[in-house]
């Protein structure tokens, strides 16, 4: 079956927006007014994953780009990256596990847990203009909660 996808933007719990920082990295910073046009638009695809009552498997691609957030080991540490894919084959229902995040949603707050590395989450720093990364702690200094805004 063809995969179902929605376009959206994400802001962290501090209301920082996500923007491109070079060709293969995202960073989080506060944007206002016209600068909001810089924020990346994601294509959130609803993909196959493990059955769970409160976790929805998704893939996060960048709209109109053949780039997907993926989780890989780098120097023995789970790491978030933007990975280039063949647009003829993506998105697809059965995404490779490194592309899959378990969306956990409570009261319109979203967390994205790596399916490849359980208990590792898409995270941002408290500081401005720092890279978006994969973090191994919730409820600490780093921010793992996001809000989502739909985009046409």
């Amino acid at each position: 079956a063809p995969v179902r996808s929605l376009h959206c933007t994400l802001r962290d719990a501090q209301l920082k927006s996500l923007v491109m920082s070079g060709p293969y990295e995202l960073k989080a910073l506060h944007l206002q007014g016209q600068d909001l046009e810089q924020q990346v638009v994601f294509s959130m695809s609803f993909v196959q994953g493990e059955e769970s009552n409160d976790k929805i498997p998704v893939a996060l691609g960048l709209k109109a780009k053949n780039l997907y957030l993926s989780c890989v080991l780098k120097d023995d540490k789970p790491t978030l990256q933007l990975e280039s894919v063949d647009p003829k084959n993506y998105p697809k229902k059965k995404m490779e596990k490194r592309f899959v995040f378990n969306k956990i949603e409570i009261n319109n707050k979203l967390e994205f847990e790596s399916a490849q590395f359980p208990n590792w989450y898409i995270s941002t720093s408290q500081a401005e203009s720092m890279p978006v990364f994969l973090g191994g702690t919730r409820g600490g200094q780093d921010i793992t909660d996001f809000t989502m805004q739909f985009v046409s």
């Epitope: 079956a1 998704v58 319109n108 985009v151």
Partner: antibody, heavy 120, light 107 residues
């Protein structure tokens, strides 16, 4: 609590149009797909299409393209379905229902239905 | 389009009976399968979604299961209020499609 309240029954002549409304309350309108389903007298259920008010995305059953037009007004938390060029076979009860944007929860809530009768 | 073949089309049973209704999908639907109950003149009522998850407020005598592309609704001990028509729905692929319905009648 969640409620979907549909507009009242309609009697239309062949060739006319009708617009059915579905007013929702009790949840964040923008985050749920509104589904439209029809049921002809004594028959089963048939999916017409859906709209996500948060971004205006619409998906139609090919069978109803050109027959049904689905819209939503986020200022009034109301979805609409207009049926054009009505024929006697469009006589049915039309239901609205909801499903969360990530498709996980199924068609959980339903409106009470709107009977559209097409008769000369 | 995905075909949902529902069986039986009608079923007579008594209060207290265990009843099963089956829907066979013509292809994989990734567990996007719901069950509904409908009484005459009323809107459908959602019972189960994603194969086996019970909607809030639905009695635990209702359960759902899957084996391959076969999906089953089971009512463990029929109550008088359970006599109605039941429909399955696949919502994995457009157009979403319902089974033809199973009318559950009192024996």
């Amino acid at each position: 609590q969640v409620q979907l309240v549909q507009s009242g029954a309609e009697v239309k002549k062949p060739g006319a149009s009708v617009k059915v409304s579905c007013k929702v309350s009790g949840y964040t309108f923008s985050r749920y797909w509104i589904e439209w389903v029809r049921q002809a007298p004594g028959k089963g259920l048939e999916w017409i299409g859906e709209i996500l008010p948060g971004n205006g995305n619409i998906n139609y059953n090919e069978k109803f393209k050109g027959k049904a037009t689905i819209t939503a007004d986020t200022s009034t938390d109301t979805a609409y379905m207009e049926l054009s060029s009505l024929r006697s076979e469009d006589t049915a009860v039309y239901y609205c229902s909801t499903i969360y944007y990530d498709y996980d929860q199924g068609f959980t809530y339903w409106g009470q239905g709107t009977l559209v009768t097409v008769s000369s | 389009d995905i075909q949902m073949t529902q069986s039986p089309s009608s079923l007579s049973a008594s209060v207290g009976d265990r009843v099963t209704i089956t829907c066979k999908a013509s292809q994989d639907i990734d567990r996007y399968l719901s069950w509904f109950q409908q009484k005459p003149g009323k809107a459908p009522k959602s019972l189960i979604y994603r194969v086996k998850r019970l909607v809030d407020g639905v009695p635990s005598r209702f359960s759902g299961s899957a084996s391959g592309t076969d999906y089953t609704l089971t009512i463990s001990s029929l109550q008088p209020e359970d006599f109605a028509t039941y429909y399955c729905l696949q919502y994995d692929e457009f157009p979403y499609t319902f089974g033809q319905g199973t009318k559950l009648e009192i024996k």
